[in-house]
């Protein structure tokens, strides 16, 4: 029951996490900037992985996509890649984990198969969460290290004077959503891996005994068939007699954990 709960909770936590990663990737507020209060209107600029938006004090908002790929910073491309890889791995992990859930019966799927699928999905969730955390952290690092921080400089071009506007970059909401979502996906993945251990069929803690009568005069001692129950005088599964009864390990060269009396 605890295994089912752990697996189910891991699935739900990962599902929420991946939904969060998708939301963060699509959000426009990765970085936010207040452009100086000019005489016409206060301008607020916020930028995401895919487009940039400008909001005026009147409430008017204009958003435009980054149509050129070549002009974009390599770091932004890396962040995009990390987030997409995180989403893809997470989505595949969710698909695998649905079939791995103990509460869902699909044909005659064995527990060992479900355990393997649970482990696979758990690893996928962990990698997905790490990708999201890495992506968000790379973007945040760019802001912290003033990678995009404008330095106040002037130069005269063909069309007159060009001045870089001094702006202060702050973390947008998408960064926090991404961190939390990545963390949840990571936690969900760990829970799935833990659940996998409980799902795996454990080794039988007794050796099955097969009896081969070698002659008519062989007498079976009481307790000979009680090895599997643990009752009776012969709980250690020792040979009861030498007249042909031997443990399965002595008969087969490749013992199996699924051998029963």
């Amino acid at each position: 029951m605890a295994v089912t709960a752990c697996q189910g909770l891991g699935f739900v936590v990962s599902l929420i996490g991946i939904a969060g990663i998708i939301a963060a990737t699509c959000m426009d507020q990765w970085s936010t900037q207040d452009l100086y209060n000019n005489p016409v209107t206060a301008v607020f600029n916020y930028q995401g992985l895919w487009r940039s938006c400008v909001r005026e004090s009147s409430g008017f908002t204009e958003c435009r996509g980054y149509f050129t790929l070549l002009g974009l910073p390599a770091m932004l491309q890396a962040v995009r890649a990390l987030m997409i890889v995180g989403i893809v791995l997470g989505a595949i992990g969710l698909l695998v984990s649905i079939f791995a859930l103990k509460c869902i019966r699909i044909g005659s799927m064995e527990d060992s198969a479900k355990a393997n699928m649970t482990l696979t999905s758990g690893i996928m969730f962990i990698v997905s969460g790490l990708c999201a955390i890495a992506g968000v952290s790379v973007f945040a690092n760019m802001l912290v290290t003033n990678f995009w921080m404008s330095t106040a400089n002037m130069y005269t071009g063909m069309g007159g004077m060009v001045q870089t506007v001094q702006t202060r970059y702050t973390f947008g909401a998408a960064l926090f959503v991404g961190w939390v979502a990545g963390g949840l996906t990571l936690i969900g993945g760990v829970m799935m891996c833990i659940a996998c251990r409980g799902l795996a069929p454990e080794e039988t803690n007794y050796k099955a005994v097969s009896y081969h009568a070698s002659g008519h005069s062989v007498a079976y001692k009481p307790g000979g068939f009680k090895a599997s129950t643990g009752f009776g005088s012969n709980t250690k599964n020792k040979k009861i007699y030498d007249g042909g009864a031997r443990t399965e390990d002595e008969v087969q060269s490749y013992p199996s954990k699924h051998d029963y009396v």
């Epitope: 301008v43 400008v54 004090s57 435009r64 910073p73 932004l76 007159g160 506007v165």
Partner: nanobody, 120 residues
């Protein structure tokens, strides 16, 4: 690189009209604000009029009711329609553009100016 080019200046009689144009080109993502400033000889540069992408306008006290600012967002162009011109409107008119040219790149670009002379 972002460039701003003004046009339309010239000599006009008092009471006359003139239309100035300013076009921005280059690596442009947004132009949140486009404005016109002027500087008369020996005086400080002052705001004539400004317009945002959303259509919010602001006029200098001395031109209210006489000048009209408009813009074409698709062409990244701003226009200044000047009516009932006075000799005190004589100045070099500069176009000022606030540009978001890329991710985290915010520029304030000034044109080289166009001369408007109001004289009989």
């Amino acid at each position: 690189e972002v460039q701003v080019v003004e046009s339309g200046g010239g000599l006009v009689q008092p009471g006359g009209s003139l239309r100035l144009s300013c076009a921005a080109s280059g690596s442009i993502l947004h132009i949140p604000v486009m404005s016109w400033y002027r500087q008369a000889p020996g005086k400080q540069r002052e705001l004539v009029a400004g317009i945002s992408t959303g259509g919010t306008t602001n006029y200098g006290d001395s031109v209210k009711g006489r000048f009209t600012i408009s813009r074409d967002n698709a062409k990244n162009t701003v226009y200044l329609q000047m009516n009932s011109l006075k000799p005190e409107d004589t100045a070099a008119y500069y176009c000022n553009v606030l540009v978001v040219s890329g991710i985290g790149s915010h520029l304030e670009v000034w044109g080289q100016g166009t001369l408007v002379t109001v004289s009989s």
